[in-house]
Every structure is written in structure tokens, then in C-alpha cells.
């Protein structure tokens, strides 16, 4: 990996072993302006593999609200406006980092957690398995 | 919002003002098994709006490696295997949380940052703007 010289102005940390505890400033630097996935684009409705967005709320997690995509159909919308099962709608998933309160209900202590979320859907050619 | 009783076993935190600094355990609890997006599915190749995955590396960020999707075509692949420009390939984007080393090069001090990443692509009906 890349070795980076340590900044002499870094805060001290006694815990040099894993599990490693670090200080995190929660005053988020947001490089983006729009946080509502429904407002950010209408792709979920215009896609040939449209999806619905479901609100997943968990007060023990940061962020507490995550939007989860569910494909509306198993097939894809064709030019005639029919759901065509010769193609398949599938969710595009991504692993994201969240903060989980640990111990539970603590406002200032968290553990990093990786969770898999469905972000939207795409239309794919199915893999056909025939029985011998 | 939901009020949760504070756990009496929580670590102390002197800083009660924003920017709020919290303790985060970096020993990640991973609810998923497969972390390589290329291995987890071949949707990026089988989609009617296929995409390439580009590695974005930044040692000042945690996670340091993020995979960015770039749609291969402006149009979508039709049943004949040709790119059809009556439809559009568009990236599905998601805001994710990352940790940014702050001050720079510090191993134990971070700031939360929201960044927008493209996770994959979907095929949409274009919005046609007619000239009056």
C-alpha cells in the first residue's frame, strides 16, 4: 500500500490494537446537494426495469434512513408497454458503510458496519438453465 | 423523531456541541460475504445498459477504494445486439458515507463525508424536448 507520512498535528490515540477506535467528526462535509432519491431523478419510473423506493429506518444506525429499491417486475418493459419476461429486472446492489450505535442507544459511540443495499434496477438477459 | 433512552454504559464525551466528535470502532461488522463487485454478479455485462467499473483510490479516504460505474453507451442494447439510441443508458447514483482523514494523513482522526457514486446503469425512455 501507499505509506503516508503522519501529520505531527494528529490527535493522540492510545489504542494501537484492533479493534481500532478512531475519532470521527460527524459534521458531514456534503459534496452533493440533493439527498432525496425520489427528487434526484425520475429514473425509477422511466426505466425499462422500474423500481419502487422503500424507506428503511433504524434509529440505532447512522444514517437512520436508507432508501431501498425493489424492482417492480420480474421482466422488463418493452416498446409495446408490456412486461417482457425474455428479459429480467434485477436489483443493482452496493455495499455501503454505516455507523451502528455500540453499545446500543449511545449517542457518541459507534461501530462501522457494511450493509448491502439495492440502489436501483437494471434489465439483463437471463441465463437459461435447461433440464437434461 | 424517536427518543431512545441513553445507555448508562456509554463512553463519556465532553464535546456536546457541533461539530460533534464521536468514537468509532473500525473493526467492521460485515453483514455481507462478497465484496468484489465484479464477482458478486455479472449484471454489468448482461445489462441492456452495460457499464464498466473503474477503480477510484484515495488513501486519505476510508474506504480507500471505491468502484465507479461508467455506462458503456449512450443508448441501450436492443434484441439484435445493437445500440438503440431511442433509449438511454443512465447511471444510477447513490450518496454514500465515507471517512475523510482530517487533519490530512492522520491515522486516527476522520470527518464524515457524503459522496455521490455511480453504482450501475439502467435503460430509460428519454425525455424528448420539442422545439416550438
Amino acid at each position: 500500500g501507499i505509506t503516508i507520512p503522519r501529520n505531527p498535528g494528529c490527535p493522540n490515540s492510545e489504542d494501537k490494537n484492533f479493534p481500532r477506535t478512531v475519532m470521527v467528526n460527524l459534521n458531514i462535509h456534503n459534496r452533493n446537494t440533493n439527498t432525496n432519491p425520489k427528487r434526484s431523478s425520475d429514473y425509477y419510473n422511466r426505466s425499462t426495469s422500474p423500481w419502487n423506493l422503500h424507506r428503511n429506518e433504524d434509529p440505532e444506525r447512522y444514517p437512520s434512513v436508507i432508501w431501498e429499491a425493489k424492482c417492480r417486475h420480474l421482466g422488463c418493459i418493452n416498446a409495446d408497454g408490456n412486461v417482457d419476461y425474455h428479459m429480467n429486472s434485477v436489483p443493482i446492489q452496493q455495499e455501503i458503510l454505516v455507523l451502528r450505535r455500540e453499545p446500543p442507544h449511545c449517542p457518541n459511540s459507534f461501530r462501522l458496519e457494511k450493509i448491502l443495499v439495492s440502489v436501483g434496477c437494471t434489465c439483463v438477459t437471463p441465463i437459461v438453465h435447461h433440464v437434461a | 423523531g424517536i427518543t431512545i433512552p441513553r445507555n448508562p454504559g456509554c463512553p463519556n464525551s465532553e464535546d456536546k456541541n457541533f461539530p460533534r466528535t464521536v468514537m468509532v470502532n473500525l473493526n467492521i461488522h460485515n453483514r455481507n460475504t462478497n465484496t468484489n463487485p465484479k464477482r458478486s454478479s455479472d449484471y454489468y455485462n448482461r445489462s441492456t445498459s452495460p457499464w464498466n467499473l473503474h477503480r477510484n483510490e484515495d488513501p486519505e479516504r476510508y474506504p480507500s477504494v471505491i468502484w465507479e460505474a461508467k455506462c458503456r453507451h449512450l443508448g441501450c442494447i436492443n434484441a439484435d445486439g445493437n445500440v438503440d439510441y431511442h433509449m438511454n443508458s443512465v447511471p444510477i447514483q447513490q450518496e454514500i458515507l465515507v471517512l475523510r482523514r482530517e487533519p490530512p494523513h492522520c491515522p486516527n482522526s476522520f470527518r464524515l463525508e457524503k459522496i455521490l457514486v455511480s453504482v450501475g446503469c439502467t435503460c430509460v425512455t428519454p425525455i424528448v424536448h420539442h422545439v416550438a
Epitope: L74, N82, Y85, H129 | -
Partner: antibody
């Protein structure tokens, strides 16, 4: 309570068309799809068509040229039209709700309407 | 079209016994999203079908826990651990992974 009720003509002459209505209550057609399934006397079940919550449709290709499905969300009604009926179209016609939880199963069914094709 | 084969046409059982009904598909029922859309319905005489099991092994609400579903790919089984009189009727497997959605020919559960 979820309910689906089919209403049809009962008797149809050969080569004529059939129109059946499915009236639903206890749920909204903007949130659930509705299937049509038929069952000839003493035989198995045959799926015909579905109209999804968003208005898109999926047909059984073997019957597509003869079938037409539509709905009126405000009246909670789904309509099936079938053309050029023959005697082997004699069957019990059921409408069934597509579950709302992405299982793609038919979770509630109407009691059916009997259709006889005869001159 | 996907063919769902349900042998036998009739299954005589004694009340209190276990019953096992099989369903075989002519093609894999695994969707590209990884799920398998194989369901089981029961049709009692003079009634419309009722959903028992969805997506291979999930009991629909109100269905007694003596009903269980299992299987993968192309081979599926519905088990009734202790048959009761109200369980008699025709059991249909059905798939919604591929269009047209299809039903098995049905297995009639009757008293021995």
C-alpha cells in the same frame, strides 16, 4: 378485508366475444396487480394475463391475439375481453390479486364466474 | 412454456399421516435476481384456489405450520406433517419466474 368478485355473461355463442369484470375491495389497484386464470370443467388451471399496479401488462402469448385487459383504478375494476370464443373456452374464469410483497404469487382469488360457450 | 409435472394425480392418505407432494419443472425456476418463484395452492371442491406457500418455502398468512415447502432449481416438494380432513383437495404447484406463468396438473389428496 380483501375481496375480488367476477361478473360475466354466463353464456356466450361461438365466435362471439366475452367481457368479464373483476370488482375488488379492501385494496387499491394502484398498489396491486390482478391476474386472470381459467379452469375448464374437471381440468387444471391456465393463466391468461395480468395487469400490474403501474398499468403495464403481461399476456400468455398463446392467447394474446384474442385477449385484452384494462382497468379503472378509481372504480376498482379490472376488465377482461376475449374474442372469437370456441367451445374449448368453456371454463370457470377467476381473477386473482398479485401479492404486494414482490413474491409474484396470487394471494387472493375471486370465487370465479362460469362461462359456457354454446350455440 | 415451462412444464410443471406433478406425479401422482391422486395421493391417498390416512388422517394423521404425513403427505408429500412433488413438483418438477422442465427448466430452472431461479430468476436472474437469485429468487425462485415457485408457489403452492390448494383448491378444495367447489372453491377457488388458495395460496399456501410462496417462493418455495414461505407459508402464507394463516396457513398452519404443518404445511412446509422445500426444493430448489427444478425439484420441489410440499409436505403436510399430519393430514387433517380440511386438507383434502387438489394441490397445484405454480411458477411465476417465466411467462406464461404455469400450473402443475394438480395432485388430489384423498382419504385412503
Amino acid at each position: 378485508e380483501v375481496k375480488l368478485k367476477e361478473s360475466g355473461p354466463g353464456l356466450v355463442a361461438p365466435s362471439q366475444s366475452l367481457s368479464i369484470t373483476c370488482t375488488v375491495s379492501g385494496f387499491s389497484l394502484t398498489s396491486y396487480g390482478v391476474h386472470w386464470v381459467r379452469q375448464p370443467p374437471g381440468k387444471g388451471l391456465e393463466w391468461l394475463v395480468v395487469i400490474w399496479s403501474d398499468g403495464f401488462t403481461t399476456y400468455n402469448s398463446a392467447l394474446k391475439s384474442r385477449l385484452s385487459i384494462s382497468k379503472d383504478n378509481s372504480k376498482s375494476q379490472v376488465f377482461l375481453k376475449m374474442n372469437s370464443l370456441q367451445t374449448d373456452d368453456t371454463a370457470m374464469y377467476y381473477c386473482a390479486r398479485n401479492d404486494g410483497s414482490y413474491y409474484y404469487a396470487m394471494d387472493y382469488w375471486g370465487q370465479g364466474t362460469s362461462v359456457t360457450v354454446s350455440s | 412454456d415451462i412444464e410443471l409435472t406433478q406425479p401422482p394425480l391422486s395421493l391417498p392418505v390416512s388422517l394423521g399421516d404425513q403427505a408429500s407432494i412433488s413438483c418438477r419443472s422442465s427448466q430452472s425456476l431461479v430468476h436472474s435476481n437469485g429468487n425462485t418463484y415457485l408457489h403452492w395452492y390448494l383448491q378444495k371442491p367447489g372453491q377457488s384456489p388458495k395460496l399456501l406457500i410462496y417462493k418455495v418455502s414461505n407459508r402464507f398468512s394463516g396457513v398452519p405450520d404443518r404445511f412446509s415447502g422445500s426444493g430448489s432449481g427444478t425439484d420441489f416438494t410440499l409436505k403436510i406433517s399430519r393430514v387433517e380432513a380440511e386438507d383434502l383437495g387438489v394441490y397445484f404447484c405454480s411458477q411465476s419466474t417465466h411467462v406464461p406463468f404455469t400450473f402443475g396438473s394438480g395432485t388430489k389428496l384423498e382419504i385412503k
